[in-house]
């Protein structure tokens, strides 16, 4: 878990990028809630389940997907940055590097098809944003929001995912459990 500073967003719904399908065999790099029966790799991820949950009836193993978005590149990240030291500058150009997980490809909710398009209008009560913020927080976390839709990868990737994650569809958030196939047909736009 190391790195050079904390993060600037959560996840975004978008199309699969070039090179991603080939890398979906690495899908297991995505987070999983591990217990003793998971593979060594899953155990190494070490994402804990709160002990209080079992006593209250929640599922023990619910995978936490890592939505890997290559499109947001930091222009100036230094090792001196920390979790809470302000907002970075974003490069909105699409990166072609294929990476495990769901990557931005055919222009999703963060990378707009028209650079001059206005950001989505949201109510101030649910989402406040200072002007001129390049990477809108709501766009960045769109994959974690209710109603998020996940694009449909190639068939082998779907099979691979279904083998890894057997729990039922996750309404809206697509955070734990299988990426719902019913949600994998459309891009998520704002």
């Amino acid at each position: 878990m190391g790195g050079n500073s904390m993060a600037s967003g959560v996840g975004v719904g978008a199309g699969l990028g070039a090179g991603v399908n080939q890398r979906m065999d690495s899908y297991a790099h995505m987070n999983g809630w591990s217990n003793g029966s998971y593979s060594m790799m899953q155990d190494q991820l070490g994402y804990p389940q709160h002990p209080g949950l079992n006593a209250h009836g929640a599922a023990q193993m619910q995978p936490m997907h890592r939505y890997d978005v290559s499109a947001l590149q930091y222009n100036s990240m230094t090792s001196s940055q920390t979790y809470m030291n302000g907002s970075p500058t974003y490069s909105m150009s699409y990166s072609q590097q294929g990476t495990p997980g769901m990557a931005l490809g055919s222009m999703g909710s963060v990378v707009k098809s028209e650079a001059s398009s206005s950001p989505p209008v949201v109510t101030s009560s649910s989402h406040s944003r200072a002007p001129c913020q390049a990477g809108d927080l709501r766009d960045m976390i769109s994959m974690y929001l209710p109603g998020a839709e996940v694009p449909e990868p190639a068939a082998p990737s779907r099979l691979h995912m279904s083998q890894h994650y057997q729990s039922g569809p996750v309404p809206g958030t697509a955070i734990n459990g299988t990426l719902p196939l019913s949600h994998m047909h459309h891009h998520h736009h704002h």
Partner: nanobody
Framework: EVQLVESGGGLVQPGGSLRLSCAAS?????????MGWFRQAPGKERELVAA????????YYADSVKGRFTISADNSKNTAYLQMNSLKPEDTAVYYC???????????WGQGTLVTVSS
């Protein structure tokens, strides 16, 4: 190794308040300036409750907590907070903080803190 540690959970009566804290420790950090609070109620899916970028210039709240919860961050302490007011029984859940933006996902997760709203 980055560690996120939540605190502030507990038992509270309906209508009461709690303030959750999420402290980041353990050396260097990834990415920049986003923290999220998730919750998972018994038998339900995990949901994003609130998120903040920077020290508050960009925030998000789930509809279910609008006007009741406030997310904030203290840059100097590498800590995020979730102020929860007018708590309801349906707010009962394990609350997790998340961070570690790395190429599109939250990478670092706390262990969770249990919030129980009951009379």
């Amino acid at each position: 190794e980055v560690q996120l540690v939540e605190s502030g959970g507990g038992l509270v009566q309906p209508g009461g308040s709690l303030r959750l804290s999420c402290a980041a420790s353990g050396g260097g950090f990834r990415g920049n300036a986003v923290m999220g609070w998730f919750r998972q109620a018994p038998g339900k899916e995990r949901e994003l409750v609130a998120a903040i970028r920077g020290s508050g210039e960009d925030t998000y709240y789930a509809d279910s907590v609008k006007g009741r919860f406030t997310i904030s961050a203290d840059n100097s302490k590498n800590t995020a907070y979730l102020q929860m007011n007018s708590l309801k029984p349906e707010d009962t859940a394990v609350y997790y903080c998340a961070g570690g933006w790395r190429r599109g996902y939250f990478q670092d997760w706390g262990q969770g803190t249990l919030v129980t709203v009951s009379s």
